[in-house]
Amino acid sequence: ENSTSPLSADPPVAAAVVSHFNDCPDSHTQFCFHGTCRFLVQEDKPACVCASGYVGARCEHADLLAVVAASQKKQ
């Protein structure tokens, strides 16, 4: 089966699993709210790689710590 290199830990994998992965199918374009869908080969299920500033299984929550840190950096 086709697989690529493991998911990097940065950005974090919402499913908290590091594994080989495939692209998700077209049907899953809206599976992740603020991130990229990756289909985990071993677990045989989709997972989300969250965009910076988002967390949660579907990257559905803004990471308040990241928001605070970013605003402090600006100051």
Partner: antibody
Framework: EVQLQQSGAELVRPGASVKLSCTVS????????MHWVKQRPEQGLEWIGR????????KYAPKFQDKATITADTSSNTAYLQFSSLTSEDTAVYYC?????????WGQGTTLTVSS | IQMTQSSSSLSVSLGDRVTITCKAS??????LAWYQQKPGNAPRLLIS???NLKTGVPSRFSGSASGKDYTLNITSLQTEDVATYYC?????????FGGGTKLEIK
């Protein structure tokens, strides 16, 4: 081991409603979409629609848009398929399913017979 | 996405190597399944991801992919393999199925 257990056969009158269930074990339904498929006697397979149990979002094949309602209860790890205003055309076997790349999972099917 | 099984029926002999084909109208990137169905029974999933044989399915079954063309092979047909076979794409929604290929003994 992942198992999809569907509710038993139903015999209902035309015009009535019915709700079929699919209880999943060995897999958290919030982790992926759950789908329903129809097969009429001696015919092929037809996709009805799907639900994202994590948020309740649904998507239907156009012909089932006004006929079927798919819901899910994450506390019991169960997906449901409800029909309204049943006609003889709805007589079929209905399957719940979830497909991965390496494995696929199907329920055993629920036979729905619409007859007066 | 349309899935076309060019043969609705195939006349075969026991022991034959059987090839069933399925063509997708668009690229589905191997998100394809094969099912076996016997009269009065539920479809039985044989292969997912175009090539991944489901646990418990005999090794005489195999799947392959080339572009938009997908193939189910049975190396030596057994009596219990006489059935109708369906392909299905699950790359995009709506999921779509081929019309089925029925194997009939000569």
């Amino acid at each position: 081991e992942v198992q999809l257990q569907q509710s038993g056969a139903e015999l209902v009158r035309p015009g009535a409603s019915v709700k079929l269930s699919c209880t999943v074990s060995g897999f958290n339904i919030k982790d992926d979409y759950m789908h329903w498929v129809k097969q009429r006697p001696e015919q092929g397979l037809e996709w009805i629609g799907r639900i994202d149990p994590a948020n309740g979002h649904t998507k239907y094949a156009p012909k089932f848009q006004d006929k079927a309602t798919i819901t899910a209860d994450t506390s019991s790890n169960t997906a449901y398929l409800q029909f309204s205003s049943l006609t003889s055309e709805d007589t079929a076997v209905y399957y719940c399913t979830r497909m991965g790349l390496r494995r696929g999972y199907w329920g055993q099917g629920t036979t729905l017979t619409v007859s007066s | 996405i349309q899935m076309t099984q060019s043969s609705s029926s195939l006349s075969v002999s026991l022991g034959d190597r059987v090839t069933i084909t399925c063509k997708a109208s668009e690229h589905i990137n191997s998100w394809l399944a094969w099912y076996q169905q016997k009269p009065g029974n539920a479809p039985r999933l044989l292969i997912s991801g175009a090539t991944n044989l489901k646990t418990g399915v005999p090794s005489r079954f195999s799947g392959s992919a080339s572009g938009k063309d997908y193939t189910l092979n049975i190396t030596s047909l057994q009596t219990e393999d006489v059935a109708t076979y369906y392909c299905q794409q699950y790359w995009g929604t709506p999921w779509t199925f081929g019309g089925g290929t029925k194997l009939e003994i000569k």
